[in-house]
């Protein structure tokens, strides 16, 4: 450990005195002390001499000698008082910054230890300390405000009683900063911007933090913009706002805008895109197929995405037929805004009835004009079947009519016994009709097909069944020849009510 001469903890001298402080160690040594004038430093191997031949109150302070090469980091110190009757205080710093709940050292050093009994801490202009200010004093270091609070951010003076009067130090500004949880919070509005060339635009970048010490800037395509800053203090947070006002936008104003804020904790940034267009636009699209097929009785939502600027002046859903002149109920139409320039419009069609098949059109209007998007809705039906016995060109023929959508396939079965429906054990013969005759096939309607089965002789203890099926379901009709004539049976289980 280095040794200081004179070997006393503190030294008291008068202004103008000569002071020599010598430090000796095993290796090279270094002095550290308050920044003050008139000192001369002389080093010679393992010793170092700090001297002045004109001490002033500003030389008051603690001088520490260290040995850099010492692994234990030992040091020695001596405190020097230069007792100036006119200057009881040597202030080492005029601004002290701490965080809340930290101890704040106000470094006013007493120049005469005799004065310690009459020292006090006051606020500038002779104001008393705020209530609950907990502080202590050290003649070597100054006043310490313990666990400083934000409200204690004040200007302080150290006071000493000299000859019955109070002598003040120069003021020390204490700034107690709120504990910062992270970089400033940011907002950049709007999140997206579209303007027609020549229109006005405004972009607002704002940042807030519990502490006033932070920076914020707005940049356009990596170029920092020079914008006047508006400050505010709101909800116990400091806010800084940059507002970019463009009276007449042009294409060079388009691009990426970033709002960037930083403090001791780090940096936050957020971006938006500004698009400048030549004229108004209105685009309609759908993620759905414009040709829709739904089973009767089920529901469907038709969705249209709209991209538009300026905003829509009008929109509606229209039913274009062919079944009736009914229009969609407004309560079934729903609009949601994804963001400023994109919207989704939904038409809900619950429990679809046969008369609701057809074309549905969404129409929208803005200053760019009208646009429409049309859906074609076809309903799917399970087949309905009927069979009659007739003679065609003198031949006995079973005629099966099947109606449904999609177009039904037809299969004939002949089975033993009288039954409403042939089962596998009874089947005697099966005929597939790959190409039944299409009787009617209009858009949005059921498809009706006809299949003929020529039967030379009807077997009386047998059943002839026409079966039709499509992707929705199946239907059948059993024909039972009886002596008095033909008898037909629609199956009991098939009673279709849409």
């Amino acid at each position: 450990i280095p040794v200081i001469e004179p070997s006393v903890p503190e030294l008291v001298v008068k202004p103008g005195a000569t002071v020599t402080l010598r430090c000796v160690g095993n290796g090279s040594v270094e002095w550290d002390g308050p920044p003050s004038p008139h000192w001369t430093l002389y080093s010679d191997g393992s010793s170092s001499i700090l001297s002045t031949n004109n001490a002033t109150f500003q030389n008051t302070g603690t001088y520490r000698c260290t040995e850099p090469g010492d692994p234990l980091g030992g040091s020695a110190a001596i405190h020097l008082y230069v007792k100036d009757p006119a200057r009881p205080w040597n202030v080492l710093a005029q601004e002290v910054v701490v965080f809340e709940d930290q101890d704040a050292l106000l470094p006013c050093l007493l120049t005469d230890p005799v004065l310690e009994a009459g020292v006090s801490l006051v606020r500038v202009r002779g104001r008393p300390l705020m209530r609950h200010t907990n502080y202590s004093f050290s003649p070597w270091h100054g006043f310490t405000i313990h666990r400083a609070k934000f409200i204690q951010s004040q200007d302080y003076q150290c006071s000493a009683l000299m000859g019955g009067r109070k002598v003040m130090s120069i003021s020390i500004r204490l700034k107690v900063q709120k504990v910062i949880p992270g970089p400033p919070a940011l907002t950049l509005v709007p999140a997206e911007l579209v303007r027609i060339r020549g229109e006005a635009a405004q972009i607002v970048c704002s940042a807030s933090s519990v502490d006033v010490n932070f920076d914020v800037f707005l940049q356009h395509n990596n170029t920092k913009l020079a914008i006047p800053q508006q400050s505010d203090f709101h909800n116990n947070r400091y806010q800084k706002v940059l507002t970019l006002n463009l009276d007449q936008v042009d294409f060079q104003h388009a691009g990426n805008y970033s709002c960037v804020a930083s403090n001791v904790q780090g940096k936050h940034s957020t971006s938006m895109f500004f698009r400048v267009v030549e004229s108004a636009y209105l685009n309609l699209s759908s993620e759905q197929n414009l040709i829709q097929e739904v089973t009767v009785g089920e529901g469907l939502n038709l969705k249209v995405m709209v991209e538009a600027y300026p905003g829509l002046q009008g929109f509606n859903w229209t039913y274009l037929g062919p079944f009736s002149d009914h229009q969609p109920e407004p309560k079934l139409a729903n609009a949601t805004t994804k963001d400023t320039y994109r919207h989704t419009f939904t038409l809900s069609l619950p429990r679809l009835k046969p008369s609701e098949a057809g074309r549905y059109s969404f129409l929208a209007r803005n200053p760019g004009g009208w646009r429409a998007l049309t859906f074609e809705l076809t309903l799917r039906y399970p087949p309905e079947v009927s069979v009659i016995w007739t003679f065609i060109n003198g031949s006995g023929t079973l005629l099966c009519a099947a109606s449904g959508y999609p177009q039904p396939n037809v299969t004939w079965l002949q089975c033993s016994g009288h039954t409403d429906r042939c089962d596998e054990a009874q089947v005697l013969q099966v005929w597939d009709d790959p190409y039944p005759e299409v009787l009617s096939q209009e858009p949005f309607h059921k498809v009706t097909v006809q299949s003929l089965l020529t039967v030379e002789t009807l077997e009386h203890n047998q059943t002839y069944e026409c079966r039709a099926h499509n992707s929705v379901g199946s239907g059948s009709w059993a024909f039972i020849p009886i002596s008095a004539g033909a008898h037909t049976h629609p199956p009991d289980e098939f009673l279709f009510t849409p």
């Epitope: 809340e100 606020r123 500038v124 202009r125 104001r127 705020m130 209530r131 609070k149 934000f150 409200i151 951010s153 004040q154 200007d155 500004r173 204490l174 700034k175 508006q230 400050s231 505010d232 203090f233 709101h234 909800n235 116990n236």
Partner: antibody, heavy 121, light 111 residues
């Protein structure tokens, strides 16, 4: 001691602007915020804004934003408040004030004597 | 903005009696245990004068018959023994956030 000396009374027509001054003495002008508060005849007090002469930071009451401009001349230790587009309801006594006790000013303990502004056609 | 509502609008109290003025804030004005609420006295033709800061600290040179209390949203200015020179209008003011706002004022007179 700390003092704030304000300029004399003004009479203005609607639509005009008025610029008043507040000369500070007894302290370091650049170290403390100066606030402006007005009081219409028979009415309460209304904070308008503040300026920090050290770096010319400003805080404005949004109610007056665009109509109020706060400036300082540090060489003359003087703060200025300009109010534009005057209307009859701007008739009031305008005070400059401050705390002069720290960077953050929680209260106003020094006030100017006030400048009376009358707006009349 | 924080709205401060003072009550009553006017108050008549006999000399030597206690006077109490209330101030209610539209939101809390406390931070870290301190209330950012101040009280001022204004006499006709004069600027306001600070009486109480941070809810209860008495300003230098203010007689100790004046006191302040309260926290959060409810604050009170009390004059323990009314003197003739206390006839004035009293305002509360918050410095919790900008814009700084004042109460509407309470006019105190002698009964």
């Amino acid at each position: 001691q700390v003092q704030l000396q304000q300029s004399g009374a003004e009479v203005k027509k609607p639509g005009a602007s008025v610029k008043m001054s507040c000369k500070a003495s007894g302290y370091t002008f650049t170290s403390y915020w100066i606030h402006w508060v007005r009081q219409a005849p028979g009415q309460g007090l209304e904070w308008m804004g503040a300026i920090y002469p050290g770096n010319r930071d400003t805080n404005y009451n949004q109610k007056f934003k665009g109509r109020v401009t706060l400036t300082t001349d540090t060489s003359a230790s003087t703060a200025y408040m300009e109010l534009s587009s005057l209307r009859s309801e701007d008739t009031a006594v305008y005070y400059c004030t401050g705390a002069f006790a720290g960077y953050y000013d929680w209260y106003f303990d020094v006030w100017g004597q006030g400048t009376t502004v009358t707006v009349s056609s | 903005d924080i709205v401060l509502t003072q009550s009553p609008d006017s108050l008549a109290v006999s000399l030597g009696e206690r006077a109490t003025i209330n101030c209610k804030a539209s939101q809390g004005v406390d931070y870290a245990g301190d209330s950012y609420m101040n009280w001022y006295q204004q006499k006709p033709g004069q600027p306001p004068k600070l009486l109480i800061y941070v809810a209860s600290d008495l300003d230098s040179g203010i007689p100790d018959r004046f006191s302040g209390s309260g926290s959060g949203t409810d604050f009170t200015l009390t004059i323990s023994s009314l003197q003739a020179e206390d006839v004035a209008t009293y305002y509360c003011q918050q410095s919790y956030e900008d814009p700084r706002t004042f109460g509407g004022g309470t006019t105190l007179e002698i009964k």
